[in-house]
């Protein structure tokens, strides 16, 4: 596959991943009520996200409440907010870096510098994926740990929500896309004879003895 095709595929994956990350960040479904026993008579499901919590009645009526105080939030919610928003913003920066380094754009003159810019874009997307993966895994670890903790009240046990799965899929796309962008950039820099014109040096002047240097002859 050519470097341009790798770049395009990588960028498409990264853009889809970026969209998924924005979706995961905004959805109030990082954790959802776990129904462990048939004898719990409940008419509602609770969803919790980074920005709000929602109560869904059995009738289908949903009521959401945005978290009032940042200081009242748990450490992992505050950290997840910071890291996911940072990942989304970094992916936005990575998009412009990648476009600047893309072979189909003229922002940067063709050459090793352009390939390096493209490589930087790929690395930024890889870093985005890793950055987003931290809060997703941290949050999931807490949810799972509390689910199996016998001290946690039954009605306060939660399961992993859809937002976490969307987030994991998004980070996978960001990292795979980032790798493809890096590969595309590497293909460009790795074959200078194909990518860039070869420069020949002028023959050296004759030596004092009048002989030409032997190494100038093919």
């Amino acid at each position: 596959m050519g470097s341009a095709a790798l770049e395009i595929l990588g960028l498409v994956l990264c853009l889809v991943g970026w969209g998924g990350l924005i979706l995961a960040c905004g959805l109030p479904m990082w954790q959802v009520t776990a129904f462990l026993d048939h004898n719990i008579v409940t008419a509602q499901t609770t969803w919790k996200g980074l920005w709000m919590s929602c109560v869904v009645q059995s009738t289908g009526h949903m009521q959401c409440k945005v978290y009032d105080s940042v200081l009242a939030l748990s450490t992992e919610v505050q950290a997840a907010r910071a890291l996911t928003v940072s990942a989304v913003l970094l992916a936005f920066v990575a998009l412009f870096v990648t476009l600047a380094g893309a072979q189909c754009t003229t922002c940067v003159a063709p050459g090793p510098a352009k390939a390096r810019v493209a490589l930087t874009g790929g690395v930024l997307y890889l870093f985005c994926g890793l950055l987003a993966l931290v809060p997703l895994c941290w949050f999931a670890n807490i949810v799972v740990r509390e689910f199996y903790d016998p001290s946690v009240p039954v009605s306060q046990k939660y399961e992993l929500g859809a937002a976490l799965y969307i987030g994991w899929a998004a980070t996978a796309l960001l990292m795979v896309g980032g790798c493809l962008l890096c590969c595309g950039a590497w293909v460009c820099t790795g074959r200078p004879d194909l990518s860039f014109p070869v420069k020949y040096s002028a023959p050296r002047r004759p030596t004092a003895t009048g002989d030409y240097d032997k190494k100038n002859y093919v």
């Epitope: 462990l36 026993d37 719990i40 450490t75 016998p150 001290s151 946690v152 009240p153």
Partner: antibody
Framework: EVQLVESGGGLVQPGRSLKLSCAAS????????MAWVRQAPKKGLEWVAS????????YYGDSVKGRFTISRDNAKSTLYLQMKSLRSEDTATYYC??????????WGQGVMVTVSS | DIVMTQSPSSLAVSAGETVTMNCRSS????????????LAWYQQKPGQSPKLLIS???TRESGVPDRFIGSGSGTDFTLTINNMQAEDLAIYYC?????????FGAGTKLEL
């Protein structure tokens, strides 16, 4: 030996605040959920509030929700109960308890809180 | 909320006899997930703090004499004291430790 020693009780006027403390020893404090349970004079037991290991999760009984705040300081092995807008029905002996697996396995000697004008 | 109902409220007993008290919950305390019944029994002697005797309906705490036996189904539970001793005179409370709000029964008082 597990020991739970409550302090901070006394006579307080309705509408005022009071903070109870519970000094724990004889076990690794941060490894356990902790709780407050109260008992009105000549009455039964009533669960007040519970708190998770590091204080991330707190749970309250309906009668105290919004008025009482449970907290803990793991470095000092101390449990707290901040009581605001006290009412006469809050008059009780307040017990600090260790709270594994949702039951209460060790209890303090209790501290009396009297709400009266 | 789960309502706990204890019966009888008081019981006249004699040393050496077998004493039985009951506790009923308004909903099942049996968890199909981990196959456990979440009911605890406490003993409170006059002027003292409550003491945990039994958890998970039938698991005796360490140091609790084996004359104390807990049993029961999902909603109906029993605490039996075999060979009643004078030191067993107290109020006995049941508590559901299934879910919040954790609730106690009104107690069964054992009297001579």
């Amino acid at each position: 030996e597990v020991q739970l020693v409550e302090s901070g009780g006394g006579l307080v006027q309705p509408g005022r605040s009071l903070k109870l403390s519970c000094a724990a020893s004889g076990f690794t404090f941060s490894d356990y959920y902790m709780a407050w349970v109260r008992q009105a004079p000549k009455k039964g037991l009533e669960w007040v509030a519970s708190i998770s290991y590091e204080g991330r999760n707190t749970y309250y009984g309906d009668s105290v929700k919004g008025r009482f705040t449970i907290s803990r300081d793991n470095a000092k092995s101390t449990l707290y109960l901040q009581m605001k807008s006290l009412r006469s029905e809050d008059t009780a002996t307040y017990y600090c308890t260790r709270h594994p697996r949702r039951y209460f396995d060790y209890w303090g000697q209790g501290v009396m809180v009297t709400v009266s004008s | 909320d789960i309502v706990m109902t204890q019966s009888p409220s008081s019981l006249a007993v004699s040393a050496g006899e077998t004493v039985t008290m009951n506790c009923r919950s308004s909903q099942s305390l049996f968890s199909s997930g981990d196959q456990k019944k979440f009911l605890a029994w406490y003993q409170q002697k006059p002027g003292q703090s409550p003491k945990l005797l039994i958890s998970l309906a039938s698991t005796r705490e360490s140091g609790v004499p084996d004359r104390f036996i807990g049993s029961g189904s999902g909603t109906d539970f029993t605490l039996t004291i075999n060979n009643m001793q004078a030191e067993d005179l107290a109020i006995y409370y049941c508590q559901q430790h299934y879910d919040i709000p954790y609730t106690f029964g009104a107690g069964t008082k054992l009297e001579l």
